[in-house]
């Protein structure tokens, strides 16, 4: 299953970044696991997870990390409190869990570049 | 508002053939699996099978395989269900269901009498 | 295929009392993804079935919190805290998670 992430994203000098992920349709998939991977090297590690269902047609990532929203076959991601040592490519992998058959797809990853923003200088 | 019409039920003789119909309005219709599930007189609700509205591929329950064909037309957002070489035992109200994780949307009801 | 066991046939509830009715899988209906596609629906006569539970415990939107169910792997149960008259029909347990997906045979629940 093809799976399609923008390839650079710049993350906000609040240190969030967004964007979507999005999968071939659907079909009938009435339940999809959407992960965000962080990959550094040959490690991946999981950044956040979410299951929505498309009777709610709104994911809500039950995660300190992510917050998102889905509509039919895009999800909107949004990653909170990066720091400059987040910077690095991170990959959506969806998963069509129900009902069967079981499919799996993995973006190629987006690029996130995390700026820390400069202190203020004192005020006299 | 979401619907599932049912029609096409009739008194039919054995070894004759029916198709009953199901349409869907208020809804991507490709977007649900479609579901055939079976009420004999008294009796309790057996699952026929499904058919995936966006790839057309229908799965039947072993008892369903061979005389009953699922199929779609997705220009008029309906749902067939096709019975050949009919039986007595097949006298029963068919019911169709949309399916997500569960069965919120079902048709009415259209009855098969199968009788000489 | 899993068989799906209810039991009682049925049941005969005076208004107000509580009542129970259980759903028995012969293998464990947890899906590979871990999840428990069990399904409670009421049907009443001339009437299609209605949703009142899915995924074992959640109950469908506009299902009074009378109605909740329970259980794991194989045994399942749907509670009727307070039983009222419109709560009459038959009940069935449903299994989504392997193909054949089945209901049970059904619970007769008729009111004093």
């Known amino acids: 299953m093809h799976v399609a992430q923008p390839a650079v994203v710049l993350a906000s000098s609040r240190g969030v970044a967004s964007f979507v992920c999005e999968y071939g349709s659907s079909g009938n998939a009435a339940e999809v696991r959407v992960t965000v991977l962080r990959q550094a090297g040959s490690q991946m590690t999981e950044v956040c997870a979410a299951t929505y269902t498309v009777e709610d047609e709104l994911a809500f990532l039950d995660d300190s990390t992510c917050t998102g929203t889905s509509s039919g076959n895009k999800v909107n991601l949004t990653i909170q409190g990066l720091r400059a040592m987040d910077t690095g490519l991170y990959i959506c992998k969806v998963e069509l869990m129900y009902p069967p058959p079981y499919y799996v797809g993995m973006g190629n990853g987006t690029q996130i570049y995390v700026i820390d923003p400069e202190p203020c200088p004192d005020s006299d | 508002e979401i619907q599932l019409v049912q029609s096409g039920g009739d008194l039919v003789k054995p070894g004759g053939s029916l198709r009953l119909s199901c349409k869907a309005s208020?809804?991507?219709?490709?977007?649900?699996?479609m579901n055939w599930v079976r009420q004999a007189p008294g009796k309790g609700l057996q699952w026929m099978g499904w058919i995936n509205t966006y790839t057309g591929e229908p799965t039947y329950a072993d008892d369903f395989k061979g005389r009953f064909t699922f199929s779609l037309d997705n220009a008029k957002n309906t749902l067939y269900l096709q019975m050949n070489s009919l039986r007595a035992e097949d006298t029963a109200v068919y019911f169709c269901a949309r399916r997500s994780i569960y069965y919120p949307y079902w048709g009415q009801g259209t009855t098969l009498t199968v009788s000489s | 295929d899993v068989l799906m066991t209810q039991t009682p046939l049925s049941l005969s509830v005076s208004p107000g009392e509580p009542a129970s009715i259980s759903c028995r899988s012969s293998?464990?209906?947890?899906?590979?993804?871990?999840?428990?596609?069990l399904e409670w629906y009421l049907q009443k006569p001339g009437q299609s079935p209605k949703l009142l539970i899915y995924?074992?415990?959640n109950r469908f939107s506009g299902v009074p919190d009378r109605f909740s169910g329970s259980g794991s792997g194989t045994d399942f149960t749907l509670r009727i805290s307070r039983v009222e008259a419109d709560d009459a029909g038959v009940y069935y347990c449903f299994q989504g998670s392997h193909v054949p997906w089945t209901f049970g045979g059904g619970t007769k629940l008729e009111l004093k």
């Open positions: 208020g809804y991507t219709f490709t977007n649900y699996g």
């Open positions: 293998q464990s209906i947890v899906y590979s993804n871990g999840n428990t596609y």
């Open positions: 995924k074992v415990s």
